[in-house]
Interface confidence: low
């Protein structure tokens, strides 16, 4: 019952152009090119996209026309390799162009940069944006796709089309409002925050596929879809998992046209079969395509069937456990994961995967034993500590969050993680710890039954950011170990790290703690980042500093900034008071 059985097409590019329509085709090609050549100017990408689009149209008119039978990778790769400045701008990435497909595409993929050296996006004045939007709406929206795609080379392309649609709607509505800024700015903030979260979630999916393989991704998908669709049969869930795996494999592999096309097919299938999938899909399925796909991806869990029998009967008490396992290991483990997950919407996906791994390890050992049943009879008892560990951790951290508030909770995590992995760059530690700290306001407000799936699955996404940033410039064996050994045990691995006793403290550098009047004009968020950067540097200089010592220095620092920002001669205040602060901090920390 695969959704994706298709006849072979004479021209792949014509097939995708017809399926997706010109507007989506052009947008997706622009995203693909910007995700590969992240440093190229906007105008160059637009030119390449227009050339590809014109060529696609000739293939739609005549599928037998010259080059129309070439694969999309060949067509797109040939086009990217026409960029004149490839060697100067990208260095060794230009060597990809000497390769044949499919190695050339693999080569481009390997050069995607999760942290490209691009300027921060600065938001212009509202009137300036509205004028640009009215003057040339098409260029304005293309620019949005380009800027997001080049900064987020794994952004889920069909979802980026959905964001662009909302971006356009925001400008269409707000640029004619009485108070343009009051209307537009909250919408843009929401899109920015949701966009960052969407990018990070997709980055985890791609890392899961690329670093741990299809089996790991499918296991994740079985668990998540079983929680979401507990009334669906195992065969239905398996079918959805297979199709979802194809969609994400394509998007993570740069096959964005195929990915968007197949995602649309999957949404269509789900809506046509919602009676056997979930009762929660009705509203989603009434929406237009982009909204429909997004809505399905975010849909709430359906209610659990009332009459689910005990798991023990089939997976512990049955005399056929080893026989069923031996006959089809992955199918049997998939059924175990499905049955466990549909009964436990209160567990995180990663916890469910740890339980399935424990069950698998037990069967591997016990099915070779003299008395298998006796050996695996207590397997469910082994689950107890695995369940309690994240429960306790979340309880403790939510209590800490409620006591401190978000900013100070982030600071506690900054100190904690800097002590664990002090070799990691300061910007990475600040970014990751700030995001880890957001788990408090995101998840601690939920009732007990929703806390763990919210918190631990969010932490998996954030820790993956640390892993991909660290992989670009590896500096810590401990980070490498936690990131590569087991996808589902990353969070417990980082949680278990103690202070790195082998770390040699950084030399003290007064320049790091020299501040200027420009800090006064920063937004609250940017000011927090400055202070948190200083905090990480302090811990790197004095990793054995106590909480109390660090708190005293940070309080002094906050007072110093407040005082100098109120001064008439701010710059002089920062220079003179700054020296005193550095001296006092050195004394307080014994530097």
């Amino acid at each position: 019952r695969g959704v994706f059985r298709r006849d072979a097409h004479k021209s792949e590019v014509a097939h995708r152009f017809k399926d997706l329509g010109e507007e989506n085709f052009k947008a997706l090609v622009l995203i693909a090119f910007a995700q590969y050549l992240q440093q190229c100017p906007f105008e160059d990408h637009v030119k390449l996209v227009n050339e590809v689009t014109e060529f696609a149209k000739t293939c739609v008119a005549d599928e037998s026309a010259e080059n129309c039978d070439k694969s999309l990778h060949t067509l797109f790769g040939d086009k990217l390799c026409t960029v004149a400045t490839l060697r100067e701008t990208y260095g060794e990435m230009a060597d990809c162009c000497a390769k044949q497909e499919p190695e050339r595409n693999e080569c481009f993929l390997q050069h995607k940069d999760d942290n490209p050296n691009l300027p921060r996006l600065v938001r212009p004045e509202v009137d300036v944006m509205c004028t640009a939007f009215h003057d040339n709406e098409e260029t304005f929206l293309k620019k949005y796709l380009y800027e997001i795609a080049r900064r987020h080379p794994y952004f889920y392309a069909p979802e980026l089309l959905f964001f662009a649609k909302r971006y356009k709607a925001a400008f269409t509505e707000c640029c004619q409002a009485a108070d343009k800024a009051a209307c537009l700015l909250p919408k843009l903030d929401e899109l920015r925050d949701e966009g960052k979260a969407s990018s990070a979630k997709q980055r985890l999916k791609c890392a899961s596929l690329q670093k741990f393989g299809e089996r790991a991704f499918k296991a994740w998908a079985v668990a998540r879809l079983s929680q979401r669709f507990p009334k669906a049969e195992f065969a239905e869930v398996s079918k959805l998992v297979t199709d979802l795996t194809k969609v994400h494999t394509e998007c993570c592999h740069g096959d964005l046209l195929e990915c968007a096309d197949d995602r649309a097919d999957l949404a269509k299938y789900i809506c046509e079969n919602q009676d056997s999938i979930s009762s929660k899909l009705k509203e989603c399925c009434e929406k237009p395509l982009l909204e429909k796909s997004h809505c399905i991806a975010e849909v709430e869990n359906d209610e659990m069937p009332a009459d689910l029998p005990s798991l023990a009967a089939d997976f512990v008490e049955s005399k056929d456990v080893c026989k069923n396992y031996a006959e089809a290991k992955d199918v049997f483990l998939g059924m175990f994961l499905y049955e466990y997950a549909r009964r436990h919407p209160d567990y995180s996906v990663v916890l469910l995967l740890r339980l399935a791994k424990t069950y698998e390890t037990t069967l591997e050992k016990c099915c070779a034993a003299a008395d298998p049943h006796e050996c695996y009879a207590k397997v469910f008892d082994e689950f107890k500590p695995l369940v309690e560990e994240p429960q306790n951790l979340i309880k403790q951290n939510c209590e800490l969050f409620e006591q401190l508030g978000e900013y100070k909770f982030q600071n506690a995590l900054l100190v904690r993680y800097t002590k664990k992995v002090p070799q990691v760059s300061t910007p990475t530690l600040v970014e990751v710890s700030r995001n880890l700290g957001k788990v408090g306001s995101k998840c601690c407000k939920h009732p007990e039954a929703k806390r763990m799936p919210c918190a631990e699955d969010y932490l998996s996404v954030v820790l993956n950011q640390l892993c991909v940033l660290h992989e670009k410039t590896p500096v810590s064996d401990r980070v490498t170990k936690c990131c590569t050994e087991s996808l589902v045990n990353r969070r417990p691995c980082f949680s278990a790290l103690e202070v790195d006793e082998t770390y040699v403290p950084k030399e003290f550098n007064a320049e790091t703690f020299t501040f200027h009047a420009d800090i006064c004009t920063l937004s609250e968020k940017e000011r927090q980042i400055k202070k948190q950067t200083a905090l990480v540097e302090l811990v790197k200089h004095k990793p054995k500093a106590t909480k109390e010592q660090l708190k005293a220095v940070m309080d002094d620092f906050a007072a110093f900034v407040e005082k100098c920002c109120k001064a008439d001669d701010k710059e002089t205040c920062f220079a003179e008071e700054g020296k005193k602060l550095v001296a006092a901090s050195q004394a307080a920390l014994g530097l």
Partner: nanobody
Framework: QVQLQESGGGLVQPGGSLRLSCKAS????????MGWYRQVPGKEREAVAT???????FYANSASGRFTISRDNAKSTVYLQMNNLKPEDTGVYSC?????????QGQGTQVTVSS
């Protein structure tokens, strides 16, 4: 565990034909594009033909018009029909999914074209 088992190679005279088979296991064969590759000692492994999950075939210039790639998803097998073989087609032929998600490839099957 991803496994790929190629067969069908052998010694053949110029102008002759061979049909190579590659049986795959350990992954969902039907959703991946597959490729046949040729390895000649001292040279980089090169793609001869690839076939998308939907069944669209693509060929290297050297194989176009002489080779035909096909797949049977029910049997998790990809085939390469090679006609009008030339001495420069000699090499070890192996198959694998074209995605970077799998690093696996089979042992390959030797094809020798010689009179």
């Amino acid at each position: 565990q991803v496994q790929l088992q190629e067969s069908g190679g052998g010694l053949v005279q110029p102008g002759g034909s061979l049909r190579l088979s590659c049986k795959a296991s350990g992954f969902t064969f039907s959703i991946y594009s597959m490729g046949w590759y040729r390895q000649v000692p001292g040279k980089e492994r090169e793609a001869v033909a690839t076939i998308s999950s939907g069944g669209s075939p693509f060929y290297a210039n050297s194989a176009s018009g002489r080779f035909t790639i096909s797949r049977d998803n029910a049997k998790s097998t990809v085939y390469l029909q090679m006609n009008n073989l030339k001495p420069e087609d000699t090499g070890v032929y192996s198959c694998s999914p074209i995605t970077s998600i799998f690093k696996a490839q089979g042992q390959g099957t030797q094809v020798t074209v010689s009179s």
